[in-house]
């Protein structure tokens, strides 16, 4: 079988200030069953982003369906992009476990921000 | 309070059709997954059929061919049209909503649905 | 095809356990759900193989491992009379499953 890769195919994604910047994930598999997190940074200190599981992320919004139940396109879209937002962004696959277990990340995707247009 | 309420059962003749609705409120319907399962008379459950918030749909073999799930977000309606009823599809219908993970974590009361000649 | 016990008893008050087996971890989640009577509506007492919506009583517990589930009722009541079904839903195939149902019956 097979193992699983998280794909992030955007090594880097600029965004002009106040728009909405979009996040390419793909899953090769959906086996083992678990869900997708995406982070800011990588450590202990790193920052969630977006929860398939639960959680409340207003700025955030799945590309593709996500009740679907052969989705594995866990792309994103964050709105109203500021200065703040830079980083390097991470597609990370869990496996369920109590609690679940990190399993497979992304490269990861770079998200620079330019000044708004005047 | 989630609230799930179907209707649209009855008895009918093997051969013949029913819709049946399930009517939502209490969440947002149209983020969620939700399905049909099915319970025949001193039976277990069986699931039948489920459909994504964006129309994606899915069935048991036994019923493929012949029901059809659908929904309304505009109305928070879910909708199983089920045609050629056989005896075998004597059961009560309830509607369910899905997890993340496409489990139920909320039931309406059902409805029955019984095939009789 | 996922299997559970058709019945267990259990004296007031001790912890009962009801397994099902037959799925496979990797690929399957777990819920269970309970029905006080057939043909009564389904009430979900755990999902996601060990969480627990909020109406449920901490009493109920569940847990996976391998190719079991196991559903805990710690410090059994009277109220907790009723069929248990294990459900799974199966990632490869798309498909949710049920076991037959356990009896529960409370002494």
């Known amino acids: 079988e097979e193992e699983l890769q998280v794909i992030q195919p955007e090594k880097s994604v600029s965004v002009a200030a106040g728009e909405s910047a979009t996040l390419n994930c793909t899953a090769t598999s959906l086996i083992p069953v678990g869900p997708i997190q995406w982070f800011r940074g990588v450590g202990p200190g790193r920052e969630l982003i977006y929860h398939q599981k639960e959680g409340h992320f207003p700025r955030v919004t799945p590309v593709s369906d996500p009740t679907k139940r052969n989705n594995m396109d866990f792309s994103i879209r964050i709105s109203n992009i500021t200065p703040a937002d830079a980083g390097t962004y991470y597609c990370v696959k869990f496996r369920k476990g109590s609690p679940d277990v990190e399993l497979k990340s992304g490269a990861g995707t770079e998200l620079s921000v330019r000044a708004k247009p005047s | 309070d989630v609230q799930l309420v179907e209707s649209g059962g009855g008895v009918v003749r093997p051969g013949e059709s029913l819709r049946l609705s399930c009517a939502v409120s209490g969440f947002r319907f149209s983020s969620h997954a939700m399905s049909w399962v099915r319970q025949a008379p001193g039976k277990g459950l069986e699931w039948v059929s489920g459909i994504s918030s964006g129309g994606d749909t899915y069935y048991v073999d036994s019923v493929k061919g012949r029901f059809t799930i659908s929904r309304d977000n505009s109305k928070n309606t879910l909708y199983l049209q089920v045609n050629s009823l056989t005896a075998e599809d004597t059961a009560i219908y309830y509607c369910?909503?899905?997890?993340?993970?496409?489990?139920?974590?909320?039931w309406g009361l059902g409805t029955l649905v019984t095939v009789s000649s | 095809a996922l299997t559970q016990p058709a019945s267990v008893s259990a004296n007031l008050g001790e912890t009962v356990k009801i397994t099902c087996s037959g799925g496979?971890?990797?690929?399957?989640?777990y819920g269970w759900y309970q029905q006080k009577s057939p043909g009564s509506a389904p009430v979900t007492v755990i999902y996601s193989d060990d969480e627990r919506p909020s109406d449920i009583p901490s009493r109920f517990s569940g847990s996976a491992s391998g190719s079991t589930a196991t559903l805990t009722i710690t410090g059994v009541r009277v109220e907790d009379e009723a069929i248990y079904y294990c459900?799974?839903?199966?990632?490869?195939?798309?498909?949710?499953?049920f076991g037959a149902g356990t009896t529960l019956t409370v002494l």
């Open positions: 496979d971890s990797s690929s399957h989640y």
């Open positions: 459900g799974a839903y199966d990632g490869s195939t798309y498909a949710n499953t």
């Open positions: 369910a909503r899905e997890t993340w993970n496409h489990l139920f974590d909320y």
